[in-house]
């Protein structure tokens, strides 16, 4: 229903704490360079204004849209042009163009230093002094580095953070309590970020229909006992929630997500038998839990898919009558039977089925033409299954770091023009798929691997879009989202690439590497590996292994030496010579 004051409506629905958190996230995602204090001031002003509207919905400006109110606040920031350049031009536009302009200026790779975690004692001190400010800093720092982070989910992670600090700061050994727990939250939050970015990309590039198809497949896998009408309703609502969050309408998004969670918990009987545990939790935990709830048990008596979609005489008639509904029921029926497939694969199968009907229903004898469609799915299913087997075997053999290196070599050969930091980031993320998915039961591996890889490759595409350098990458990124992963997998060595000349300084290291944390050491070594491949794109795995082993040995020796600096300056040049010889 329409409300006299949108801001009062949202404040009442969400409550002050969530309202303030969401406004802070919104501002931090739009203006990524502003400090926490600048944003906190704006948030307080907006909150005070919302309270006046709650007291009197007819008060001045209370009838304005949220975009107008928030946009006016952002545009009133001093030195906007100095700090944000052409983003300031957005302020010359009217709504809704102004908000669209802000969205277009969101930066997926802002030049901000990595978010460093303070040491335990300092963290606990500032948390105890002012928990609200501490959590505000967390929201601000994450939101500005991840401008499409799913806002209500970020509130959930902040709540997790809060609970961990409350528990661990009371312990004697704060460090060993905090580190593993916060690392776990960070890992989950980073995965959540790339997954949500993929959803926003789907929405931005291919529209609501594409996202809704994704949702139908995903929901049908999770709730195989729900009927098509129920799945369609959930998919429609989920599409609305994601459209709002991707569009910067974070208050509406969080409010609608809470409504959807409420609806699901009130209608468990027609959705799934697995929801009760989630529904017993408070709001943020409930919505999070529902988003990753285990699959319900599949009905035992499902007829073969062929009955309605191949053998039925009415296939083309049903398709003609309502294409989207018929394809939607196909996607629903196929997905509920295959929780062991990735959503990307299910969407490829639905696309293949659609293409088959488009071709066959135009023929004189359609049944003879589409009769073999299910058999034609086989290669599409085998390809990702083989990918999972090959990569999990490799991961089990090499471990995470070695697996990342194998991927780094492979992707540097596919797209050597891409910057080394981007290749290293991508390979490290892609390599984590092993730890994340290869340890799962067989029937969960494929969906885990492929949907995770698709999300990571989406980030590769977004970064490459900013500065396109590789035709290979451009080709894979300009196709449909579900075809990206197979496209990247099929890429081979880029024959057009002119190898980089060998620069000794690229492979020159100093004693400061010895004191770096393990992760930073790995990144340094992986940077060198990517540069080696750029110098010799056709180097064999054996040659690269020889060089990297030598390099590891060199680091080990010099880092243990009494006079590290001398070791690095004398042994370093010898290492460079040996590397050149090994790759000659």
């Amino acid at each position: 229903e329409a409300h006299k004051s949108e801001i009062a409506h949202r404040y009442n629905d969400l409550g002050e704490q969530h309202f303030k958190g969401l406004v802070l996230i919104a501002f931090s995602q739009y203006l990524q360079k502003c400090s926490y204090d600048e944003h906190a001031k704006l948030v307080q002003e907006v909150t005070d204004f919302a309270k006046t509207c709650v007291a009197d919905e007819s008060a001045a400006n209370c009838d304005k849209s949220l975009h107008t109110l928030f946009g006016d606040k952002l545009c009133a920031i001093p030195n906007l042009r100095e700090n944000y350049g052409e983003l300031a031009d957005c302020c010359t536009k009217q709504e809704p163009e102004r908000n669209e302009c802000f969205l277009q200026h969101k930066d997926d790779n802002p030049s901000l230093p990595p978010f460093e975690r303070p040491e335990a004692e300092a963290m606990c001190t500032s948390f105890k002094e002012n928990p609200t400010t501490f959590m505000g800093h967390y929201l601000h720092e994450v939101a500005r580095r991840h401008p499409y982070f799913y806002a209500p989910e970020l509130l959930y992670y902040a709540e997790q953070y809060n609970e961990i600090l409350t528990q661990c700061c009371a312990e004697a050994d704060k460090e060993s309590c905090l580190t593993p727990k916060l690392d776990g939250v960070k890992e989950k939050a980073l995965v959540s970020s790339v997954r949500q970015r993929m959803k926003c990309s789907s929405m931005q590039k291919f529209g609501e229909r594409a996202f809704k198809a994704w949702a139908v497949a995903r929901l049908s896998q999770t709730f195989p006992n729900a009927d098509f009408a129920e799945i369609t309703k959930l998919a429609t609502d989920l599409t609305k929630v994601n459209k709002e969050c991707c569009h910067g309408d974070l208050l509406e998004c969080a409010d609608d997500r809470a409504e959807l969670a409420k609806y699901m918990c009130e209608n468990q009987a027609t959705i799934s038998s697995k929801l009760q545990t989630c529904c017993d939790k408070p709001l943020l935990k409930k919505a999070h839990c529902l988003s990753e709830v285990e699959h319900d048990t599949m009905p035992a008596d499902l007829p073969a898919i062929a009955a309605d979609f191949v053998e039925d005489q009415e296939v083309c008639k049903n398709y003609a009558e309502a294409k989207d509904v018929f394809l939607g029921t196909f996607l629903y029926e196929y997905s509920r039977r295959h929780p062991d497939y990735s959503v990307s694969l299910l969407l490829r199968l639905a696309k293949k089925y659609e293409a088959t009907l488009e071709k066959c229903c135009a023929e004189a004898n359609p049944p003879a033409c589409y009769g073999t469609v299910l058999a034609e799915f086989q290669p599409l299913v085998e390809e990702p299954k083989n990918l999972v087997k090959t990569n999990c075997d490799l991961y089990e053999k090499l471990g995470e770091y070695g697996f990342q290196n194998a991927i780094l070599v492979r992707y540097t050969q596919k797209a050597p023009q891409v910057s080394t930091p981007t290749l290293v980031e991508a390979a490290r993320n892609l390599g984590r798929v092993g730890t994340k998915c290869c340890t799962l039961p067989e029937d969960q591996r494929l969906p885990c691997v492929e949907d995770y890889l698709s999300a990571i490759l989406n980030r590769v595409c977004l970064l490459h879009e900013k500065t396109p350098v590789s035709e290979h990458v451009t080709k894979c990124c300009s196709g449909s989202l579900v075809e990206r992963r197979p496209c990247f997998s099929a890429l081979t060595v880029d024959e057009t690439y002119v190898p980089k000349e060998f620069k000794a300084e690229t492979f020159t290291f100093h004693s400061d590497i010895c004191t770096l944390p393990e992760k930073e050491k790995q990144i340094k070594k992986q940077t060198a590996l990517a540069e080696l491949v750029k110098h010799k794109p056709k180097a064999t795995a054996e040659q690269l292994k020889t060089v990297m082993d030598d390099f590891a040995q060199f680091l080990d020796t010099c880092c243990k030496a009494a006079d590290k600096d001398t070791c690095f300056s004398t042994e370093g040049p010898n290492l460079v010579t040996r590397c050149k010889d090994a790759l000659a």
Epitope: C316, A320, C361, A362, A364, P367
Partner: nanobody, 115 residues
Framework: EVQLVESGGGVVQPGNSLRLSCAAS????????MSWVRQAPGKGLEWVSS????????LYADSVKGRFTISRDNAKTTLYLQMNSLRPEDTALYYC????????SSQGTLVTVSS
């Protein structure tokens, strides 16, 4: 909403001709193959003829081959069946259908061949 409306049926003597029409609406006509099926009194549905969406490809039941011609006008979204040398056994309700469908989703048009 898909609509198929047949017309052109009637009573004719054996050896004569009739031309049936089927006006289609509610879907992309040119993207779909179309068929004629018939149901003689007290019998089941029998497939008669089919044509591809472009009109370039046609198929006929042995019982009508050489006597009937299926065609279409995609601009008018209309399907036709030219029936020559009609026989008493061609007496039936004739339906047009989408794709290879053997079903009656329309009223049909009655063809009676009798001396």
């Amino acid at each position: 909403e898909v609509q198929l409306v047949e017309s052109g049926g009637g009573v004719v003597q054996p050896g004569n001709s009739l031309r049936l029409s089927c006006a289609a609406s509610g879907f992309t006509f040119s993207s779909f193959g179309m068929s004629w099926v018939r149901q003689a009194p007290g019998k089941g549905l029998e497939w008669v003829s089919s044509i591809s969406g472009s009109g370039s490809d046609t198929l006929y039941a042995d019982s009508v081959k050489g006597r009937f011609t299926i065609s279409r006008d995609n601009a008018k979204t209309t399907l036709y069946l030219q029936m020559n040398s009609l026989r008493p056994e061609d007496t039936a309700l004739y339906y047009c259908t989408i794709g290879g469908s053997l079903s009656r989703s329309s009223q049909g048009t009655l063809v009676t061949v009798s001396s």
